[in-house]
């Protein structure tokens, strides 16, 4: 079972640098479109951070689709050599906190939250249900945790630690969950399946964080949330690697998970979309 193959990956303390995309469409999911042709194309996978092959149906789809691997790399990857490797402490807000609110192109209007850089606080906004950008949070708390400054000049980082602006010392921040487990996948992997507002019955997969497996559900065709994948493989790739167990300073090691119905602290995989 491919699910089990992913269980024991070693993750070191020096993680990948934050992903800075040259174009926002590089963050789109691979979309084969409604047609039935079998055409080899390439897309940029934000989770593996590399260009990968997929089968395109020949019509519609989105801009994250390239004729060749080279074209994909040229459009969606940068030379990483001159980038500073991210340490475990994130001292600044993610880039996406500074993006303007983006309702997207759909019309299943729902309430979401974004960080308003003018007012320096998280606010609600009217989201259309699809696309937009990453300055988009399901809850006020999530928005505040990721984008707002903490009290007394602290910047709260994604790992439950505060950086004291005065002397750069680390102050542990109390959390509601045992610090032994953390979720380092996208936060939407923890959301329930959401059919959305339309009347279609599309076969999709969502990640069930209680049982730790990707499960099928029927999608209405619009609205819903981002825990929504066209294939089980895509769902697993995005969400299955999320739970990790922290062990000493030597690193982080993936464990075979026995899931409990407990709240988990979210630490985003940073995907910073830069519109050029």
């Amino acid at each position: 079972d491919s699910e089990e193959d992913e269980e024991h990956t070693i993750i070191t303390d020096t993680e990948l640098p934050p992903l800075k995309l040259m174009h926002s469409f590089c963050a789109f999911k691979a979309d084969d479109g409604p047609c039935k042709a079998i055409m080899k194309r390439f897309f940029f996978n934000i989770f593996t951070r590399q260009c990968e092959e997929f089968i395109y149906g020949g019509c519609e789809g989105n801009q994250n689709r390239f004729e060749s691997l080279e074209e994909c790399k040229k459009m969606c990857t940068r030379d990483n050599a001159n980038r500073i490797i991210k340490t475990t402490l994130q001292q600044e807000k993610p880039d996406f906190c500074f993006l303007e609110e983006d309702p997207g192109i759909c019309r299943g209007y729902i309430t979401r939250y974004f960080y308003n850089n003018q007012t320096k606080q998280c606010e609600r906004f009217k989201y259309g249900g699809c696309l937009g950008n990453m300055n988009n949070f399901e809850t006020l708390e999530e928005c505040k945790n990721i984008c707002e400054d903490g009290p007394n000049g602290f910047q709260v980082d994604n790992y439950g630690t505060q950086l004291n602006a005065v002397n750069n010392s680390l102050t542990p921040q109390s959390t509601k969950v045992p610090s032994l487990f953390e979720f380092h996948g996208p936060s939407w992997c923890l959301t329930p399946a959401d059919r959305g507002l339309c009347r279609a019955n599309e076969n999709r997969f969502y990640y069930n964080s209680v049982i730790g497996k990707c499960r099928p559900f029927k999608y209405s065709g619009c609205g819903g949330n981002e825990n929504n994948f066209t294939s089980k493989q895509e769902c697993l790739r995005a969400c299955k690697k999320g739970f990790i167990q922290r062990i000493s300073k030597g690193g982080l090691i993936k464990t075979k998970r026995k899931r409990k119905k407990q709240r988990v602290k979210i630490a985003y995989e940073e995907i910073f979309v830069k519109n050029m």
């Epitope: 299943g108 209007y109 729902i110 309430t111 939250y113 308003n116 003018q118 007012t119 606080q121 998280c122 606010e123 609600r124 906004f125 009217k126 809850t139 006020l140 507002l197």
Partner: antibody
Framework: EVQLVQSGAELKKPGASVKLSCKAS????????MHWVRQAPGQGLEWIGE????????NYNEKFKTRATLTADKSTSTAYMELSSLRSEDTAVYYC????????????WGQGTTVTVSS | EIVLTQSPATLSLSPGERATLSCSAS???????LYWYQQKPGQAPRLWIS???ILASGVPARFSGSGSGTKYTLTISSLEPEDFAVYFC?????????FGQGTKLEIK
């Protein structure tokens, strides 16, 4: 003390337009959303739309998008709602109400403006 | 849009009795985004309960709110004369924001 004071009653003919005002005081006008809600005689409440005066962000109920125009004057802390192409079913009490930027708890309301549309 | 249906339309009870007002949504809404307002004749509505169960400032403890998904309830444990009014449920999970048609709580 937070206060929302609305303009006086209006009598209009079908097809005409009406512009209602809501003057805010006792709080920072630009830091809150201002909503417009109407109530037809003996009926429930109907949300028309909202405006956040600082950045001019506006959300309309699609039902009113072509006929309602929400504006705000920051210098006088006054919100306005103009409703065009009036018909008899627009006869209602129109309220302004404020809410914070994080939720839609309409914690302060104006006294209401009665608009009567009759030929 | 989300349609909120309140029942009963009118509830006739005596002071001291228990009142249960229901609000049913056409689609599931987040409990955080379900509010209640009270309105008395000739007055503007007043915020009464936010986030399904959080009483607004000045609301007596005999009021309580509960529910999730599509079913929400406002309960008054023992009616006082000042409780007789119209109560509206309100959702802001989806746009446009919508209100129920109201339940009129009248003295029997």
């Amino acid at each position: 003390e937070v206060q929302l004071v609305q303009s006086g009653a209006e009598l209009k003919k079908p097809g005409a337009s009406v512009k209602l005002s809501c003057k805010a005081s006792g709080y920072t006008f630009t830091s809150y959303w201002m909503h417009w809600v109407r109530q037809a005689p003996g009926q429930g409440l109907e949300w028309i739309g909202e405006i956040k005066p600082d950045q001019g962000r506006i959300n309309y109920n699609e039902k009113f998008k072509t006929r309602a125009t929400l504006t705000a004057d920051k210098s006088t802390s006054t919100a306005y709602m103009e409703l065009s192409s009036l018909r008899s079913e627009d006869t209602a009490v129109y309220y302004c109400a404020r809410s914070s930027v994080v939720d839609v708890a309409m914690d302060y309301w104006g006294q209401g403006t009665t608009v009567t549309v009759s030929s | 849009e989300i349609v909120l249906t309140q029942s009963p339309a009118t509830l006739s009870l005596s002071p001291g009795e228990r009142a249960t007002l229901s609000c049913s949504a056409s689609s599931s809404v987040s409990s955080s985004y379900l509010y209640w307002y009270q309105q008395k004749p000739g007055q503007a509505p007043r915020l009464w309960i936010s986030g399904t169960s959080i009483l607004a400032s000045g609301v007596p403890a005999r009021f309580s709110g509960s529910g999730s998904g599509t079913k929400y309830t406002l309960t008054i444990s023992s009616l006082e004369p000042e409780d007789f009014a119209v109560y509206f449920c309100h959702q802001w999970s989806y746009y446009p924001f919508t209100f129920g048609q109201g339940t009129k709580l009248e003295i029997k």
